[in-house]
Amino acid sequence: PKQTLPKPIIRAESTYMVPKEKQATLCCQGSYGAVEYQLHFEGSLFAVERPKPPERINGVKFHIPDMNSRKAGRYSCIYRVGELWSERSDLLDLVVTEMYDTPTLSVHPGPEVTSGEKVTFYCRLDTATSMFLLLKEGRSRDVQRSYGKVQAEFPMGPVTTAHRGSYRCFGSYNNYAWSFPSEPVKLLVTGDIENTSLAPTDPTFPDSWDTCLLTRETGLQKDLALWDHTAQNHHHHHHHH
């Protein structure tokens, strides 16, 4: 079998949901000593980078300026050390937001409920779209989808304090082009878990894995580079649409 290097890790810096006309940054984390990185978009070569000097950094950041629906879609990357190419990274779905209109998000029976109550979110958008998306702040990889002509329902079933948090919804014009986000709706769940005050709440900061962890080489990093890369590939889970 043809020998290949371990696959790189592709990430979106800050977020994979990029407002139109803003810049997206994608990092491809490969290996110290990589002489070339390639970013592929929808299966075709999109950008090429040759780090200088190659042995000093374990990846590159690709910028995608002026985000629009043409640049939204599936990205992957590969790298080369000498003449040897890596396997292809997982696919990363890059979404353009702030397209066209703003949906309205509401929750029934209301934003303050008791643990065990059934809760349904409603996302409404009057313009031509049939797919709606509900995201919880700090959990933007866990996208819930629902379909409807101008409104979609998101039944949550009986809720627990783990459902607490801030929610937004989007209308989707295709998998990679989303509307402006709705105003957030904060769901407060109180109730009969032993001690509600100690119940965990979700972080409201951006997803912790949406960061580019590129490092410059030191002696220790050189020794750990391959082990670290293999470990990260093993543990890195990436959301697919």
Epitope: S44, A47, V48, E49, V60, F62
Partner: nanobody, 129 residues
Framework: DVQLVESGGGSVQAGGSLRLSCAAS????????MGWFRQFPGKERERVAL????????FYADFVEGRFTISLDNAKNTLSLQMNSLKPEDTAMYYC??????????????????????WGQGTQVTVSS
């Protein structure tokens, strides 16, 4: 404003050579990509060769097969494409383009033509058998 003016196109026999030039003016950024693209009638422009001012680093399309060489004379702000061993299938309109680098380091280039902001008017290359 950025201006790109190509020259050097013309007609040549198969196996012959041509040197295309592109005079660039007005680019304010220190690092940028310049490239040669070509277009066949009724088709989209395709990349031929790219060069990054930060390297300079060069990138070629597979079909070039070592026949073409891209170079940049920073002092004269001139981009060149030396085309050797020309084939009839190289007949096309050739365009010079400029755009931003694909990263902060300035050592990378975008590949799709829609990532390039500035274009010359094109120069025709005709290779007869």
């Amino acid at each position: 404003d950025v201006q790109l003016v190509e020259s050097g196109g013309g007609s040549v026999q198969a196996g012959g050579s041509l040197r295309l030039s592109c005079a660039a003016s007005g680019y304010r950024s220190r690092h940028y990509c310049m490239g040669w693209f070509r277009q066949f009638p009724g088709k989209e422009r395709e990349r031929v060769a790219l060069i990054n001012t930060g390297g300079p680093t060069t990138f070629y399309a597979d079909f070039v097969e070592g026949r073409f060489t891209i170079s940049l004379d920073n002092a004269k702000n001139t981009l060149s494409l030396q085309m050797n061993s020309l084939k009839p299938e190289d007949t096309a309109m050739y365009y010079c383009a400029a755009g931003p680098p694909s990263s902060d380091s300035g050592s990378g280039c975008y590949v799709p033509e829609y990532m390039y902001n500035y274009w010359g008017q094109g120069t025709q290359v005709t290779v007869s058998s």
